[in-house]
Interface confidence: low
């Protein structure tokens, strides 16, 4: 899908006269009739398989045509095609003269014709314009031309849809070829998959838009590369999630049996020797001269 | 506001088909892009196939070549035939429906509306 784009920039008929040589009463009142069609080795009548438009009437005898895009859009002369561009086209442009106000063909006697051209050949798609002036022994034409593809459309023949976006279906726009640029933060085939905070564990994080990192059960952390011990682990990490290895001194299912009573508390007293006997217990060796639990006596 | 009643999910056996129907109504305009995306138990929604309005046709990789998604335009409706389904293709199957403003406004990135529908269970049996 495309455009094909001719823009009209002179047109000089010094003595005012048809193609007949017979002159304009009271000039030339010139208006232009485009085909593009197929290419064809002999530029031959039949359809305008490409398009057709037609201009008002521009001018009197020789003017200058003023670029009118950003007005009623008739110059450049726009002719959409929704086919792939095949590289090779044929143009004819007629200059006729419009006595009245009636410019359809069918309105027109048949002598009204002023000059009439066409040219064939290949012509690649771009933003290019190819300058050409056509010249009969009456009449001057110049005029440039280009093919540009449809918004949306890319490729060396238009034939290439991208939409930029920025949703649920894809973060990207288009390259001049129709492949995809992702927006940044967006990664994979189609630039639906978030690019997660740079460090974001691999496996035990994950992300739904750029820059985030969200973790799975189990983890937890800016990065999700701690992970979480067991409910109600005291004194214990993890190495994966919901473990309890007991730090040092520490025992059971928690890590919340003391061990090591005699470090954490010193209950023994008066200078007595203290023995861990298991979770909570102890043993203190009296010196001499005192007893008790704690030798405390 | 835009409908989507998604139908054709089940319980099927390893190796079998299904033909998933998303029907859109309501007010559809501008460009409109539909597609199917699931949801296994326990796993982030995830995109499977999706359709343009020019016809372009996207998979993901792990359904290639099995699923093909198409849609009728007169009927604001899009397909989905899974073949050769397999164990982990297990899920609730969500439609997508993606439509841009009439407004929109090339200069910028298009404005898209989404709409999601309520799902249908995906149940294959090995």
């Known amino acids: 899908s495309g455009v094909f784009q001719l823009q009209l920039q002179e047109f000089i008929n010094e003595r005012g006269v048809l193609a007949s040589g017979r002159p304009c009463e009271p000039g030339c009142r010139t208006f232009f009739r485009v085909c593009l069609k197929h290419f064809q080795a002999v530029v031959s009548p039949g359809p305008c398989t490409f398009g057709t438009v037609s201009t008002p009437v521009l001018g009197t005898n020789s003017f200058a045509v003023r670029d009118d895009s950003s007005g009623g859009g008739r110059n450049p002369l726009q002719l959409p095609f929704n086919f792939t561009w095949p590289g090779t086209f044929s143009l004819i442009i007629e200059a006729w003269h419009a006595p009245g106000d009636d410019l359809r063909p069918e309105a027109l006697p048949p002598d009204a014709l002023i000059s009439k051209i066409a040219i064939q050949g290949s012509l690649a798609v771009g933003q290019n314009w190819l300058l050409d002036e056509q010249t009969s022994t009456l009449t001057r034409l110049r005029y440039s031309y280009r093919v540009i593809c449809s918004d949306n459309y890319y490729g060396d023949n238009c034939s290439r849809l991208c939409k930029k976006r920025n949703d649920h279906f894809g973060h990207y726009v288009c390259q001049p070829d129709g492949n995809l640029s992702c927006l940044p933060g967006w990664t994979g085939e189609y630039c639906q998959q978030p690019i997660c905070l740079s460090g974001c564990h691999e496996q035990n994080g994950y992300c739904s838009k750029p820059a985030e990192c969200l973790c799975r059960p189990g983890w937890q952390g800016r990065l999700c590369n701690e992970c979480i011990p067991h409910n109600g682990c005291r004194h214990g990490t993890c190495s994966t999630p919901w473990q309890c290895t007991c730090d040092e001194g520490w025992g059971g299912l928690f890590c919340d049996q003391d061990l090591n009573y005699c470090t954490h508390h010193s209950p023994c007293k008066n200078g007595a020797t203290c023995s861990n006997s298991g979770q909570r217990s102890y043993t203190c060796t009296c010196r001499p001269g005192y007893t008790g639990v704690d030798c405390e006596l | 506001q835009v409908q989507l009643q998604e139908s054709g999910g089940g319980l099927v056996q390893a190796g079998g088909s299904l033909r998933l129907s998303c029907a859109a109504s309501?007010?559809?305009?501008?460009?409109?892009?539909m597609g199917w995306y699931r949801q296994a138990p326990g796993k982030e929604r995830e995109f499977v196939a999706g359709?343009?309005?020019?016809?372009?046709?996207y998979y993901a990789d792990s359904v290639k070549g099995r699923f093909t998604i198409s849609r009728d335009n007169a009927k604001n409706t899009v397909y989905l035939q899974m073949n050769s389904l397999k164990p982990e293709d297990t899920a609730v199957y969500y439609c997508?429906?993606?439509?841009?403003?009439?407004?929109?406004?090339?200069?910028?990135?298009?404005?898209?509306?989404?709409?999601w529908g309520q799902g249908t269970q995906v149940t294959v049996s090995s």
């Open positions: 997508a429906v993606s439509t841009t403003y009439p407004s929109y406004n090339e200069s910028q990135y298009a404005d898209w509306l989404a709409y």
């Open positions: 309501g007010s559809i305009s501008g460009d409109v892009e």
């Open positions: 359709i343009n309005d020019g016809g372009n046709t």
